[in-house]
Amino acid sequence: NKILVKQSPLLVVDSNEVSLSCRYSYNLLAKEFRASLYKGVNSDVEVCVGNGNFTYQPQVYSKTGFNCDGDFDNETVTFRLWNLHVNHTDIYFCKIEFMYPPPYLDNERSNGTIIHIKEKHLCHTQSSPKL
């Protein structure tokens, strides 16, 4: 019995930050959970983790050097990433696991979200020479 997750298929980012929402077919309320975000086709890099259970403020952290934070409501976890660069362009997968109460539950792998970080081009405006 797996939880379903909905993610936006594509996020194109002009700035260096992005908010990615993971909407679950399951209520987070009154449960102990571990919400995480993974980078790459094989989910090789754990980008961000949020641990909580609504009786205390969820703790959000990254072990892999990403700048991240998270917002949690009844059925949605929103990860906010900043200081992103072009080489962070990749596919990102949401994951949720419920540790308590039993039984342990996690989600069906989603289709992921492609986050495309656009390169910033510095425009130099040419001023015509003054006579």
């Epitope: 102990e32 571990r34 641990n51 952290y61 072990k63 696991e97 540790m99 308590y100 342990y104």
Partner: antibody
Framework: QVQLQQSGPELVKPGTSVRISCEAS????????IHWVKQRPGQGLEWIGC????????NYNEKFKDKATLIVDTSSNTAYMQLSRMTSEDSAVYFC?????????????WGAGTTVTVSS | DIQMNQSPSSLSASLGDTITITCHAS??????LNWYQQKPGNIPKLLIY???NLHTGVPSRFSGSGSGTGFTLTISSLQPEDIATYYC?????????FGGGTKLEIK
Amino acid sequence: QVQLQQSGPELVKPGTSVRISCEASGYTFTSYYIHWVKQRPGQGLEWIGCIYPGNVNTNYNEKFKDKATLIVDTSSNTAYMQLSRMTSEDSAVYFCTRSHYGLDWNFDVWGAGTTVTVSS
Amino acid sequence: DIQMNQSPSSLSASLGDTITITCHASQNIYVWLNWYQQKPGNIPKLLIYKASNLHTGVPSRFSGSGSGTGFTLTISSLQPEDIATYYCQQGQTYPYTFGGGTKLEIK
């Protein structure tokens, strides 16, 4: 209070196997990993591997992959480590310890250790 | 695997002294570094987690600092009960690894 209760000392013959246990109490078993750590006499600490009771996923130190097998019984809140093909190098104290599944980076509670002696 | 190099391997100091133990990681582990104390014949006890956070019940004379690859454990105003071996441990990535230990003795 939170406790990890380990099984008693073992004297085993070379080439045989041994299974040691770690019974958890005083906390939600499925909220924490159980890790196993080896300490040879007068030596340092060596991480063997861990198991998460929720989905029984395991992580092993490559060095111990063919030596240790980790299992859990959630009905009794007990973790087990089986060590196979015992040699004198396996004589050590083995500790079980825990780390939080969602906040997994340190070991906050330790068992008293199980002394395993390999001798013919 | 991430190697954790701890120094010195042994240390002799007088009561009331301030001592420093260092731990060097073979790659960037950010702040995912913990310190443990193991008294002779006893189990390891968590002192400091995430480089600088004091575990519950640990005296404030213990402190930790550092990030990236370099970390230090400082014990100020050394007490007789501080005689122990101290270990660092990285919790950034599996397999978790420990430093070789620093054996602290009183002069």
